[in-house]
Every structure is written in structure tokens, then in C-alpha cells.
Interface confidence: medium
């Protein structure tokens, strides 16, 4: 049928021509959209690790491509700390002693793992090279 | 005058636990931080716990920390430490000690100090 | 934490000498630095704070100077009550670490 009707091409051709595309650059997009679902079941990257690799930043260096967690929790608080004089203070506002040492506000950030991401790779602890 | 007077110093087996107590007198103890210092016998001085004037901060040598708790009853002028899972290394003579009148923790008053001996 | 050394760590003077004791810090302690006398079977008493201001009822014969990491002891005229060992303690930042001691003898 295919041979002597070529529907699949002129129907196939239809749908490309309905997405109005201006040039090859768009066509991309498409196939993101029915790929990302797909390659998302496989592996993930960790965008953040991508970013410190490219700022050659020191971090990176033992961390994995690979994403493991995909929800975490990040909680921001702050502590008291002791620092050796003011100067090392956070400001002069927050900054006090006990008489005996020098204390400041400290703010700190902990992150909490809750989920871990759905794909084949999450599980495996591969080196990346 | 400035008087500190050590005493809960004795013999002890490894593993076992004993308070120490410092009576201050002749100086407002509340204004005051405090500390334990020890020395073993023939050794030099070593810096064992402190605890600041309202008693909110305290610290320890990593050597006792997690053994050893200090505390303070203003109303009774008293100082104290409290000794656990003592070990051979920890005998030594305990001496307490008063801040001295500038910021830090310097000593500018000791007690006669309290012999803890460890041993089985 | 920060180290202090003390260099010598014994030394003998005759009496009328001018002896320097050394204490050394691992790290910058700015001048809180104290230094104490023990002498033998007695309690350690403080004689200078912030490095060289001298304790109230200490001869004048003992000074102190230095600041950051390099600190002296001075005894301008060595007496015979002067026999002891002398300590030097960090107080700019927890743990307060004392130097391991110079013992201190007459000739």
C-alpha cells in the first residue's frame, strides 16, 4: 500500500508542514519532545555538575555526572559559631563573646535527600570516563 | 583574698566516674568564666574544660570531650566536674581555675589542685 | 589547634643574668598570650597577660614582649627565688594550649 499510495511519507509530511517551522533549527525541538521522556528512563545528568565542570571549579572534580537524586529538601538556618577575633565576625551586629571567646551568626544551608531519579544508571555507581 | 579549693580527688578504677568540686570565695563568681586544668605527675599544663560566666557556654579538650561535664551553681559559688570513663592518661592533678579580669581565658587565680589517680 | 613551642626547654643561668625564654605559635594569636611560673610542688602563678602587661604583685624584673606568632619572657636580673618552670598559653581561641614548659635553673 505503502509503495503504491506513499501515505506514510505524504502523511508524515502533512504533520512536519503543520508545525510552521522557519528553519532546520526548529525541527530539533520536535524530536526533544519525544526523545527527553525516553532518555530520561535511561540516564540523567546533573546539570549542576555540568555548570562547576565548565567554571573549572575544584567541587566537580570527585563528583558524578550522573544524577542520583531528583527531590531534595533544603533548609537554610542559622547557627552560632566561634570565630578567633571581630574581624572574622559576619557583621558587627552579629557578632558577641562570652567573655572568653568571640561568637557570630552563621547561616548554613542542609540539604536532605528524599527521592532518588528513575532511570536505569541511578543505582549503578559508574565511573563517568 | 581570691580562695578556690579543690576537692572529690582520689583513687579510681579505669572506666569509673568521680566529681570534682572547687569552692570560690573572695571574688564575684558570677562575673567570672572558670576552668578545670590538669597536670600529670612530672608533665606540663594542659587545658581540660571551661565554662563562661553565665554558664550558657562551655567547652572541652578533645582529649575529654564527651566524658567530661562541666558546671556551675552560682548560687553556691561552686565549680564542677564531672569525671566518666576515666582512663590511665586522666591522672593527673586537677587545679580550678578563674579568668583573669581582661577578655580571655587566661589565669590569674589556681586552687591547690585535687589528685584524680586512675588506676586498677 | 594551635601549637605553642617553647625553646629552651631547660636551661641554667647564674644569678644577675638576663635570661630570654621563647614561645612560639602555630598560628596568628594576635597578643593574647599569658605566661605563668610554677615552681617546684607549688600551683602556677600568672606573671604577664596580652603578651606584656605584668600581673599585679610581680617583680619588675619580668617582661614580656612579642605579638603575632613570636613571643619573649624576660628576666632582667635572674634571682635565686626564680628557680621554677615557666609556661606560655595561647588565649586567643579554644582548645588554650600552654607551651610544654621551661625549667628554669641556677648555676
Known amino acids: 500500500v505503502e509503495v503504491a499510495t506513499h501515505y506514510l511519507e505524504i502523511i508524515t509530511q502533512l504533520i512536519v508542514e503543520s508545525f510552521h517551522f522557519k528553519n532546520g533549527e526548529d525541527a530539533p525541538d520536535l524530536l526533544k519532545v519525544i526523545t527527553k521522556p525516553f532518555t530520561k528512563l535511561i540516564v540523567q545528568l546533573d546539570k549542576k555538575v555540568i555548570s562547576q565542570i565548565a567554571m573549572n571549579d575544584e567541587k566537580a572534580k570527585n563528583k558524578s555526572l550522573v544524577k542520583i537524586w531528583c527531590k531534595t529538601f533544603t533548609n537554610k538556618t542559622q547557627i552560632n559559631v566561634t570565630v578567633p577575633s571581630t574581624a572574622n565576625c559576619t557583621s558587627p551586629s552579629l557578632c558577641w563573646t562570652d567573655g572568653i571567646q568571640n561568637w557570630t551568626m552563621k547561616n548554613v544551608t542542609y540539604k536532605e535527600n528524599i527521592a532518588k531519579c528513575q532511570h536505569i544508571f541511578v543505582n549503578f555507581h559508574l565511573p563517568d570516563l | 583574698q581570691v580562695q578556690l579549693l579543690e576537692s572529690g580527688g582520689g583513687l579510681v578504677q579505669p572506666g569509673g566516674s568521680l566529681r570534682l568540686s572547687c569552692a570560690a570565695s573572695?571574688?564575684?563568681?558570677?562575673?567570672?568564666?572558670m576552668a578545670w586544668v590538669r597536670q600529670a605527675p612530672g608533665k606540663g599544663l594542659e587545658w581540660v574544660s571551661a565554662i563562661s560566666s553565665s554558664g550558657d557556654n562551655t567547652y572541652y579538650a578533645d582529649s575529654v570531650k564527651g566524658r567530661f561535664t562541666i558546671s556551675r551553681d552560682t548560687s553556691k559559688n561552686t565549680l564542677s566536674l564531672q569525671m566518666s570513663s576515666l582512663r590511665a592518661e586522666d591522672t593527673a592533678i586537677y587545679y580550678c581555675?578563674?579568668?583573669?579580669?581582661?577578655?580571655?581565658?587566661?589565669?590569674?587565680?589556681w586552687g591547690q589542685g585535687t589528685l584524680v589517680t586512675v588506676s586498677s | 589547634d594551635i601549637q605553642m613551642t617553647q625553646s629552651p626547654s631547660s636551661l641554667s643561668a647564674s644569678v644577675g643574668d638576663r635570661v630570654t625564654i621563647a614561645c612560639r605559635a602555630s598560628q596568628v594569636i594576635s597578643n593574647y598570650l599569658a605566661w605563668y611560673q610554677q615552681k617546684p610542688g607549688k600551683v602556677p602563678k600568672l606573671l604577664i597577660y596580652v603578651a606584656s602587661t605584668l600581673q599585679s604583685g610581680v617583680p619588675s624584673r619580668f617582661s614580656g614582649s612579642g605579638s603575632g606568632t613570636d613571643f619573649t619572657l624576660t628576666i632582667s636580673s635572674l634571682q635565686p627565688e626564680d628557680v621554677a618552670t615557666y609556661y606560655c598559653q595561647n588565649y586567643n581561641s579554644a582548645p588554650w594550649t600552654f607551651g610544654q614548659g621551661t625549667k628554669l635553673e641556677i648555676k
Open positions: 581555675a578563674k579568668q583573669g579580669t581582661n577578655w580571655g581565658l587566661y589565669f590569674d587565680y
Open positions: 573572695g571574688f564575684t563568681f558570677s562575673s567570672s568564666a
